[in-house]
């Protein structure tokens, strides 16, 4: 565990940048900053979650522009922005800093916010190192800042993964060794038996796995029942003789302000009541003015610190502050090996060669996966396909209604009528046949094939 710290030094127009403040004719304003940390150095979608954490600064001093004056560096909030991280520090990360303007004029519905600048840096940074300085430009604006990552004891090291206690500690916990004088690092603990629980087991000799109170089993993964003390062996309470449950990550409830604690592998997670957020629900008195809804969530209510706010999350996000991304791709909606891309506002499938469609459901190369609608049949050849449509339909999938009479199929002045199963020709006197193609002799006999029984010349002839 540890804390990422960001110090903003200045924010103002860069060289050759905005000659005047953007606040003109907007009344008094003030700045605040939002920092977002994402693991890794890869290009990530802007709406992907701040998986390492996020933080909001306090509001800066109120600023009113002097008419026609050049824009100076703008007054900044006091203090550091701190983003606590629970697990190991990844070393490589993306740092996103947003500069927001809050307008304090007489706005309907309260203050208005707008994003002035956003900078993204991909960085390598070891925990415990010195402050790193940076200057970034976003449009006409220039942001100067420093940052560092520091571990919180007992964690030490460049990734905050080694555990250490001061040398004066009377007893080290499981797997801990006292720090050597004047050193930040500590001795590496012995390698325990493979699979020994990191939470409930420890070792003093390589290959062993000794259990904390309240845990048993060869790998210290079995909780000891406290309902009965009979027949139990192991470390016991001096008062009852019973095994004492070992300390868990939720012991003492690390969640402040009424948050409820739940254990996660190797750590804990706080579920915060409305009005509070942060790793331990320690950020309190939050209102919509603090912009607590991440990832484009809409904040409602919470006009003052005593009333709760609610975040209405956009599609793809959840959590009391819209801080958790819903992994809709886990449902594997893309067929035939398609790649699922969760864009936040929508899912997209990028289809493998030979497949297409919104979910890669169409096979481009043969008729196996291709549906021809309305009785059409798929014809393939040479690696290609096409739909041969039933009469009255057209288009690539035979979904479009075609006018069967458009081609004037009825010969010799016959009248064409569209029919649900095709077309019907009403022949002019003296002609018969499906398309009125056969002249009728005066004796009522056609010159070519005889009319089907029951059909007289002039009767409508249906052409299937």
């Amino acid at each position: 565990a540890g804390v990422f710290e960001l110090q903003i030094h200045s924010f103002g127009p860069g060289p050759g940048g905005a000659p005047r403040s953007p606040y003109s004719a907007r009344g008094p304003c003030r700045l605040f900053f939002r920092v977002c940390l994402k693991p890794g150095l890869s290009e990530e979608a802007a709406e992907s979650p701040c998986a390492l954490g996020a933080a909001l600064s306090a509001r800066g001093p109120v600023y009113t522009e002097q008419p026609e004056a050049p824009a100076p560096d703008l007054p900044l909030p006091n203090g550091l922005l701190q983003v606590p991280f629970r697990d190991a520090w990844p070393g490589t990360f993306s740092l996103i800093i947003e500069t927001w303007r809050e307008e304090l004029g007489d706005q309907i519905g309260g203050p208005a916010w707008s994003l002035l600048a956003r900078v993204t840096r991909r960085r390598r940074l070891a925990a415990g190192g010195p402050w790193a300085g940076d200057i970034q430009r976003a449009g006409a604006w220039e942001l100067r800042f420093s940052y560092r990552a520091r571990c919180e004891l007992p964690a030490v090291g460049t990734a905050c993964t080694r555990l250490c206690r001061p040398r004066s500690a009377s007893r080290c916990g499981p797997g801990l060794r006292p720090c050597a004088p004047l050193e930040d690092e500590c001795e590496a603990p012995p390698v325990c038996r493979a699979g020994c629980s990191l939470e409930h087991g420890f070792c003093e000799q390589p290959g062993e796995c000794r259990c904390l109170e309240g845990w048993t089993g060869p790998l210290c993964m079995v909780p000891v029942s406290t309902s009965s003390c009979l027949g139990l062996r192991g470390p016991s309470s001096t008062t009852t003789g019973c095994l004492v449950p070992g300390p868990g990550p939720c012991d003492g409830n690390p969640c402040a302000n009424g948050g409820s604690c739940s254990e996660t592998p190797g750590s804990f997670e706080c579920t915060c009541p409305r009005g509070f957020y942060g790793l331990r629900c320690e950020v309190s008195g939050v209102t919509c003015a603090d912009g607590p809804c991440f990832n484009g969530g809409l904040c409602v209510g919470g006009a003052d610190p005593d009333s709760a706010y609610i975040c209405h999350c956009p599609p793809g996000f959840q959590g009391s502050n819209c801080e958790k991304r819903v992994d809709r791709c886990s449902l594997q909606p893309c067929r035939n090996g398609g790649l699922c891309l969760d864009l936040g506002h929508a899912l997209r499938c990028r289809c493998r060669a030979g497949f297409a469609g919104p979910r890669c459901e169409h096979d481009l190369n043969d008729c196996a996966g291709r549906a021809c609608a309305n009785g059409g049949t798929c014809v393939e050849g040479g690696g290609a396909h096409r739909c041969s449509c039933a009469l009255g339909f057209g288009g690539r999938d035979c979904r479009e209604r075609a006018d069967p009479c458009a081609a004037r199929p009825c010969a010799h002045g016959g009248r064409c009528y569209a029919h649900f199963s095709g077309l019907v020709c009403a022949c002019a006197p003296g002609y018969m046949g499906a398309r009125c193609e056969f002249p009728v002799h005066p004796d009522g006999v056609s010159a070519l094939p005889a009319a089907p029984p029951g059909l007289r010349p002039g009767d409508p002839q249906r052409y299937p």
Epitope: L339, R350, C351, R352, A353, G354, F355, A356, L364, N365, G382, G383, A384, H385, R386, G395, R396
Partner: antibody, heavy 119, light 107 residues
Framework: EVQLVESGGGLVKPGGSLRLSCAAS????????MSWVRQAPGKGLEWVGR??????????DYAAPVKGRFTISRDDSKNTLYLQMNSLKTEDTAVYYC??????????WGQGTLVTVSS | DIQMTQSPSSLSASVGDRVTITCQAS??????LNWYQQKPGKAPKLLIY???NLETGVPSRFSGSGSGTDFTFTISSLQPEDIATYYC?????????FGGGTKVEIK
């Protein structure tokens, strides 16, 4: 990093033969459909043909002007794509590009190799 | 075969201009269309896939739209490095076919 490197181009007489190779790296070659695309000097792009991955049948498809004369093959153990060109004509003169066709697009291209058919 | 007709065949525009190229298919190809950029002496590069989706790493000034038979490719603000020939390509049916290309130059 995906890399495709063509080789084997050169000058050949009409009616002659030539074999182009494409060495692939930076991706799982055996899973990927591959294609050849050509470009005559000063002209546009023309698809020559493709070969599917073995898992998708390994079949080949060709454009009409080269069908029966050109053969595409692959050696997955060597991560190499081949284009065997027989009965070459002057109109086959072009830069030949080897392309990865994993998605329904020519995602990555080699630098190309020039084939000149002239007497 | 599906014919792809691109227009104009060439155009000249100033830096910062909005540039639009059209591509028309001889039959309905749904959104089964890609756009490529080819700079002089270089291999083509995929910019847009499935008619409107920007390939990873491609600047957002490039965009595509359309479905069926009519498609549009747009550069919202032309930059000097955009001097190239742009091609559309359909994958609805074999043979895979390209448009004739549009050469974009700076005034």
């Amino acid at each position: 990093e995906v890399q495709l490197v063509e080789s084997g181009g050169g000058l050949v007489k009409p009616g002659g033969s030539l074999r182009l190779s494409c060495a692939a790296s930076g991706f799982t070659f055996s899973n990927t459909w591959m294609s050849w695309v050509r470009q005559a000097p000063g002209k546009g792009l023309e698809w020559v043909g493709r070969i599917k991955s073995k898992s998708d049948g390994g079949t080949t498809d060709y454009a009409a002007p080269v069908k029966g004369r050109f053969t595409i093959s692959r050696d997955d153990s060597k991560n190499t794509l081949y284009l065997q060109m027989n009965s070459l004509k002057t109109e086959d003169t072009a830069v030949y590009y080897c392309t990865q066709y994993y998605w329904n697009s020519f995602d990555y291209w080699g630098q190309g190799t020039l084939v000149t058919v002239s007497s | 075969d599906i014919q792809m007709t691109q227009s104009p065949s060439s155009l000249s525009a100033s830096v910062g201009d909005r540039v639009t190229i059209t591509c028309q298919a001889s039959q309905d190809i749904s959104n089964y269309l890609n756009w490529y950029q080819q700079k002089p002496g270089k291999a083509p590069k995929l910019l847009i896939y499935d008619a409107s989706n920007l390939e990873t790493g491609v600047p957002s000034r490039f965009s595509g739209s359309g479905s069926g038979t009519d498609f549009t490719f747009t550069i919202s603000s032309l930059q000097p490095e955009d001097i190239a020939t742009y091609y559309c390509q359909q994958y609805d049916n074999l043979p895979l076919t390209f448009g004739g290309g549009t050469k974009v130059e700076i005034k």
